[in-house]
Interface confidence: medium
């Protein structure tokens, strides 16, 4: 998971946008990636980075046999 996220985050050169990606990786099953992205006011580049990293991280976790993760964070 870490390697894949680092690979995606490397595409985003701007530090603020890179942070948006890392914010998206945080586990949070209280809301979907789309719900969380909809509240981002920084700008479209941040929304794109957040959403891509959030979706990829969630799908990787889902494929990792649904281990008992700390959901909701």
């Amino acid at each position: 998971l870490q390697e894949k996220i680092e690979e995606i985050a490397a595409k985003y050169k701007h530090l603020v946008v890179k942070k948006c990606c890392y914010d998206g990786v945080r586990i949070n099953h209280d809301e979907t990636c789309e719900q969380r992205a909809a509240r981002i006011s920084v700008g479209p580049r941040c929304v794109k980075a957040f959403t891509e990293c959030c979706v990829v991280a969630s799908q990787l976790r889902a494929n990792n046999s649904h281990k008992d993760l700390q959901l909701g964070r």
Epitope: H29, T32, C33, H66
Partner: antibody, heavy 119, light 112 residues
Framework: EVQLVESGGGLVQPGGSLKVSCAAS????????MQWVRQAPGKGPEWVGL??????????EYAASVKGRFTISRDDSKSIVYLQMSSLKIEDTAVYYC??????????WGQGVLVTVSS | DIVLTQTPLSLAVSPGEPASISCRSS???????????LDWYLQKPGQSPQILIY???NRASGVPDRFSGRGSGTDFTLKITKVEAEDVGVYYC?????????FGQGTKLEIK
């Protein structure tokens, strides 16, 4: 182990106000959204609202049935979430549960606190 | 709001027999993040609800393996392979795909 303990329930007249509290332990409170769910006697659970963690703005969302009358707040320093209820109606009579997705997957529920609105 | 329709609303099963509860959603509960935002809870008499299944099909820690969840998108099923006396109570499905989270009406399981 995640624990949620509600307090402050009781009998209140229609139009009155009441504030219930939920003390949380066993997890890093500031890292999690907190929610309230209620259950009227003999009925199924109904979501009341949530408060996001500060990192996500600490903002709130409410069910249409309580919007404008109920307010959720949190005190991260004390690991407590509050539900302030005003302009109470008879149909607000219910057991109010504090819930969270802290700890194991799924919602963890408190024991609930009974709020009775009656004249 | 997303509407969850549970069937049946009540169920009487003999010990050792199977039981099945359906939960149908008015919208897909599978999000683009790959997670299915559907849980199953059991509320035993006089108690708070307790988690059985999360993510549509993942058994929560400590839940006996006679409980299983299946389904995707809009149609979900909770199965109990062999019902035991301690399984009595009301079963609820819950969606948290969209705000507000909504519950099914509940299915009351009784022992014959």
């Amino acid at each position: 182990e995640v624990q949620l303990v509600e307090s402050g329930g009781g009998l209140v007249q229609p139009g009155g106000s009441l504030k219930v509290s939920c003390a949380a332990s066993g997890f890093i409170f500031s890292d999690y959204y907190m929610q309230w769910v209620r259950q009227a006697p003999g009925k199924g659970p109904e979501w009341v609202g949530l408060i996001r963690k500060k990192v996500n703005g600490g903002t709130t969302e409410y069910a249409a049935s309580v919007k404008g009358r109920f307010t959720i707040s949190r005190d991260d320093s004390k690991s407590i979430v509050y539900l302030q209820m005003s302009s109470l109606k008879i149909e607000d009579t219910a057991v109010y549960y504090c819930v969270s997705r802290a700890g194991p997957p799924g919602l963890t529920w408190g024991q609930g606190v009974l709020v009775t609105v009656s004249s | 709001d997303i509407v969850l329709t549970q069937t049946p609303l009540s169920l009487a099963v003999s010990p050792g027999e199977p039981a099945s509860i359906s939960c149908r959603s008015s919208q897909s509960l599978l999000a683009s993040d790959g997670y299915t935002y559907l849980d199953w809870y059991l509320q035993k008499p006089g108690q708070s609800p307790q988690i059985l299944i999360y993510g549509g099909s993942n058994r929560a820690s400590g839940v006996p393996d006679r409980f299983s969840g299946r389904g995707s998108g809009t149609d979900f099923t909770l199965k109990i392979t062999k019902v035991e006396a301690e399984d009595v109570g009301v079963y609820y499905c819950l969606q948290h795909r969209a705000l507000p989270p909504t519950f099914g009406q509940g299915t009351k399981l009784e022992i014959k």
